[in-house]
Interface confidence: medium
């Protein structure tokens, strides 16, 4: 029951996370204009991964897409790539995890297959979350660098033909959405990986056992060995009853008189 709950919760958390990553990628507010020290606040600029917008206090908004691909900064291209990879991996992970859910029965799918699929989707969610966090962090770093460069440029003189002052930009809403969404996807992935351990079927590993008659007074007691799950304490198939039964690992080093009967 706890395994099903962990798997289900992991799926829901990852679903919310991936929806957030998609939303953040599509949002225009990755960076917003810092209006500090600006004499005219009627025009408000903000940028996304795909287009740049200008909004006025009147409500008028104009957005233009970055139609050029080669002319864009390499870092912006890298952020786009990271976010898309995150979305693709997350989408595949969601598809795999739907079939892996313990509460959903698909034909005669064994628990081992569901466990493997749960682990696969969990890893995909983790990588997806990391891609989103990395993408958002790279963009945030671009902004911080741009902000401090701009701050330095604001105090330059009026010499020369044309003076350029970079408009300072700060973190937009999309960055926070991206960070939270990436974190949720990551948490969901971890939960799926934890659920995978509980889903792993109990393996019945009977090792070859040699029985040695140690005397007429001791009879063999059946059920002396437990099936190993791989997670229990009896992983070495240690003998439970000292009724003369021994595993291959415990064969006597010195032959007894009964060995040659």
């Amino acid at each position: 029951m706890a395994v099903t709950a962990c798997q289900g919760l992991g799926f829901v958390v990852s679903l919310i996370g991936i929806a957030g990553i998609i939303a953040a990628t599509c949002m225009d507010q990755w960076s917003t204009q810092d209006l500090y020290n600006n004499p005219v606040t009627a025009v408000f600029n903000y940028q996304g991964l795909w287009r740049s917008c200008v909004r006025e206090s009147s409500g008028f908004t104009e957005c233009r897409g970055y139609f050029t691909l080669l002319g864009l900064p390499a870092m912006l291209q890298a952020v786009r790539a990271l976010m898309i990879v995150g979305i693709v991996l997350g989408a595949i992970g969601l598809l795999v995890s739907i079939f892996a859910l313990k509460c959903i029965r698909i034909g005669s799918m064994e628990d081992s297959a569901k466990a493997n699929m749960t682990l696969t989707s969990g890893i995909m969610f983790i990588v997806s979350g990391l891609c989103a966090i990395a993408g958002v962090s790279v963009f945030a770093n671009m902004l911080v660098t741009n902000f401090w460069m701009s701050t330095a440029n604001m105090y330059t003189g009026m010499g020369g033909m044309v003076q350029t002052v970079q408009t300072r930009y700060t973190f937009g809403a999309a960055l926070f959405v991206g960070w939270v969404a990436g974190g949720l996807t990551l948490i969901g992935g971890v939960m799926m990986c934890i659920a995978c351990r509980g889903l792993a079927p109990e393996e019945t590993n009977y090792k070859a056992v040699s029985y040695h008659a140690s005397g007429h007074s001791v009879a063999y007691k059946p059920g002396g060995f437990k099936a190993s799950t791989g997670f229990g304490s009896n992983t070495k198939n240690k003998k439970i009853y000292d009724g003369g039964a021994r595993t291959e690992d415990e064969v006597q080093s010195y032959p007894s008189k009964h060995d040659y009967v």
Partner: nanobody, 121 residues
């Protein structure tokens, strides 16, 4: 390289008119706000008028009703029509634009070199 070049300044009598132009040239992706500033000798630079991308205008109280700002988006040009000029309008007029260069992400603020307007009899 983006450049803002002002023209149209000169000597004019009080009550006269002048039309300033500011042409933005270079690889421009989008022009956002465009503004006219002025700086009189020994004074701080002040905002005269501004125009938004949709054409909404803002004016300093001292020039309202006398100056008109306009822009031609197809030519990337800003204009300032100055009527009923007074001696206190004497200053160097600067063109200012927030614009995004082609291949850029963020808008930068550009200034022209300035054009002198002298109102004297």
């Amino acid at each position: 390289q983006v450049q803002l070049v002002e023209s149209g300044g000169g000597l004019v009598q009080p009550g006269g008119s002048l039309r300033l132009s500011c042409a933005a040239s270079g690889s421009i992706f989008r022009i956002d706000g465009m503004h006219w500033y002025r700086q009189a000798p020994g004074k701080q630079r002040e905002l005269v008028a501004s125009i938004t991308p949709s054409g909404i205008t803002h004016y300093a109280d001292s020039v309202k009703g006398r100056f008109t700002i306009s822009r031609d988006n197809s030519k990337n040009t800003l204009y300032l029509q100055m009527n009923s000029l007074r001696a206190e309008d004497t200053a160097v007029y600067y063109c200012n634009a927030h614009l995004v260069k082609v291949g850029g992400v963020w808008s930068d603020e550009y200034w022209g070199q300035g054009t002198l307007v002298t109102v004297s009899s």
